[in-house]
Interface confidence: low
């Protein structure tokens, strides 16, 4: 189809080479009140057809996306040629950053409902470039966490180094829907609920003497509980002695509760104390046996093929640790009598 009648929008994606990030394009087809754009010719009120294109329907989910090859070849259907680009309703998701994403993307309705729809399309010229070292070193991340129940904020990564006063007007979207009230480079959330989780997009306009571009960034927001202030506690073993039968196999379980931490590096291990010697035991991998929003219970077992006299003289120590501190619980084996 002829794309000369498509409206044009220029977008800039400056990606950080330090982190994974995604990008989206919205198919910003004209709203019903702007529907003259969708006509091949301007119509006088008497000529307006019974069904104006898009009139009365805000559901523009049934759209087709194409990429325009730079060499002038025919338009390519995005779904067939680009596995790292995914279409969902009227949004195009770029899953991996890279300058090779630069180019012209065209969207139009999949169903042409009348001859007046022909020119109803949008051409988006996307320029993708890596962030230069000169850019702000401490720009906001493309993955941001909000603490449930507290006050929080979502920062636009491409503007996070600017003060609110300097910042241009920002357009925010959440999960593809326009957040019409938000215009600053930061969304302040008075009280965080789990529904604040989602994909946020922030746009602002950057102009030079020649043209103007929409600078866009995508932020994945996750709602979490606060980092624990406690070291892990050992739930099992509780007793420091354990009655055993000599010559029989034995499994001692160590279960520990670790509070939530954003950066979670739990340690749970067994070691043996034998008079002056102390060594870590190679035991089966630890496994998570219960996970909630607030904490996680991790278990690790020590397995003795058969209990010997020597084991009765040893201490079996479970050691657990998180970023706050560590806890230990030792177990002494005692021969069962009778």
């Amino acid at each position: 189809f002829n794309i000369s009648g498509c409206s044009t929008k220029k977008l800039l994606w400056t990606y950080s080479t330090r982190s994974e990030e995604e990008f989206v394009l919205f198919c910003d087809l004209p709203e019903p009140q702007k529907s003259h754009f969708c006509h091949r010719n301007r119509l006088s009120p008497k000529q307006v057809p019974e069904h104006l294109p898009f009139m009365g329907s805000n559901d523009l989910s049934d759209v087709q996306w194409y990429q325009q090859p730079s060499n002038g070849d025919p338009l390519e259907d995005i779904r067939k040629s680009y596995p790292h680009i995914i279409q969902d309703k009227c949004t195009l998701h770029f899953l991996t950053p890279g300058v090779n994403n630069s180019g012209s993307y065209i969207c139009r309705p999949k169903m042409i409902k009348s001859p007046y729809d022909v020119a109803c399309c949008v051409k988006m010229i996307l320029e993708v470039k890596p962030q230069t070292n000169a850019s702000c070193e401490y720009s906001a991340s493309h993955k941001q966490d909000l603490l449930l129940g507290s006050t929080g904020s979502i920062s636009c990564p491409s503007l996070s180094c600017q003060s609110d006063a300097q910042s241009p007007a920002v357009t925010w979207y959440k999960n593809g829907k326009l957040l019409s009230v938000e215009r600053s480079n930061r969304i302040v959330v008075d009280e965080v609920y789990d529904y604040h989780q989602g994909t946020y997009v922030c746009d602002y306009t950057q102009s030079d003497t020649v043209s103007s571009w929409t600078v866009r960034a995508v932020v994945q927001v996750r709602t979490i509980v606060g980092d624990t202030k406690l070291k892990p506690d050992i739930l099992d073993p509780v007793e420091d002695t354990l009655e055993v039968e000599l010559g029989k196999p034995l499994t001692i379980s160590c279960k520990a509760r670790f509070g939530f931490e954003r950066v979670f590096n739990p340690v749970i291990k067994w070691y043996i104390k034998d008079s002056d010697l102390e060594w870590e035991v190679s035991v089966p991998e630890a496994k998570s046996i219960k996970s909630t929003l607030k904490d996680e219970i991790i278990e690790r077992n020590i397995i003795l093929e058969k209990v010997t006299q020597r084991d009765l003289r040893r201490k079996f120590v479970c050691f657990v640790q998180n970023s706050i501190g560590n806890t230990t619980q030792s177990v002494q084996l005692k021969e069962k009598r009778g």
Partner: antibody, heavy 117, light 110 residues
Framework: SVEESGGRLVTPGTPLTLTCTVS????????MSWVRQAPGKGLEWIGI?????DTYYTSWAKGRFSISKTSTTVDLKVASPTTEDTATYFC???????????????WGPGTLVTVSS | DVVMTQTPASASAAVGGAVTIKCRAS??????LAWYQQKPGQPPKLLIY???SLASGVPSRFKGSGSGTEFTLTISDLECDDAATYYC????????????FGGGTAVVVK
């Protein structure tokens, strides 16, 4: 959206991988689960992979099934299918909902696996 | 693993009437229970979560109640479109209990 693929007729013991392809949301935020339904029978939970790639399985599925993911797909590997594994396999997004619970909010249409010699 | 037992296996009522489906958990799962509706050839659809909270877009004719081990789904003012199989699911987040479904209840609307 969520869509399963890979369902086919296999002979017992032939390893099988089902793939769930998602679009419109990020697997780094949501938990995804696999559920199956034998012809004319009820729903059976297999397991779940969280946003952080932790996996949890129902007891009968441990060792027989394994769930893994990439940025846009969630795989279910059936190590050694038996005729009892004949079923429609569903992939579902399990959202964290108000009240601290999880539930299957977005489901794929399912993919049929037939295990027969 | 927790076991979810649903009763009855099937139920029928006239249009405008009501049906009650019960679900029992083999151990205390607090309010961590969801209800789904499934029609032939379709995936399940979430109706209720947290035992009594209505999922988005679900009519208020569907009502969930209960906690601990006993749960109930009541469908009032039955419509023909309510003919389906209904499942309860334990959503307690624990490696040994998460996910178990009830056996299902087929609802026939006369």
């Amino acid at each position: 959206s969520v869509e399963e693929s890979g369902g086919r007729l296999v002979t017992p013991g032939t390893p099988l991988t089902l793939t769930c392809t998602v679009s419109g949301f990020s697997l780094s935020v949501y938990a995804m689960s696999w559920v199956r339904q034998a012809p004319g029978k009820g729903l059976e939970w297999i397991g779940i992979i969280t946003w952080s790639a932790d996996t949890y399985y129902t007891s009968w599925a441990k060792g027989r099934f394994s769930i893994s993911k990439t940025s846009t797909t969630v795989d279910l590997k059936v190590a050694s299918p038996t005729t009892e594994d004949t079923a429609t396999y569903f992939c579902a997004r399990f959202d964290y909902l108000v009240g601290g619970t999880w539930a299957g909010v977005l489901w794929g249409p399912g993919t049929l696996v037939t295990v027969s010699s | 693993d927790v076991v979810m037992t649903q009763t009855p296996a099937s139920a029928s009522a006239a249009v405008g009437g009501a049906v009650t489906i019960k679900c029992r958990a083999s151990e205390d799962i607090e309010s961590y229970l969801a209800w789904y509706q499934q029609k032939p050839g379709q995936p399940p659809k979430l109706l209720i979560y947290s035992a009594s909270s209505l999922a988005s877009g679900v009519p208020s004719r569907f009502k969930g109640s209960g906690s601990g081990t006993e749960f109930t789904l009541t469908i009032s003012d039955l419509e023909c479109d309510d003919a389906a199989t209904y499942y309860c699911q334990c959503t307690y987040w624990d490696s040994s209990t998460v996910g178990a479904f009830g056996g299902g209840t087929a609802v026939v609307v006369k």
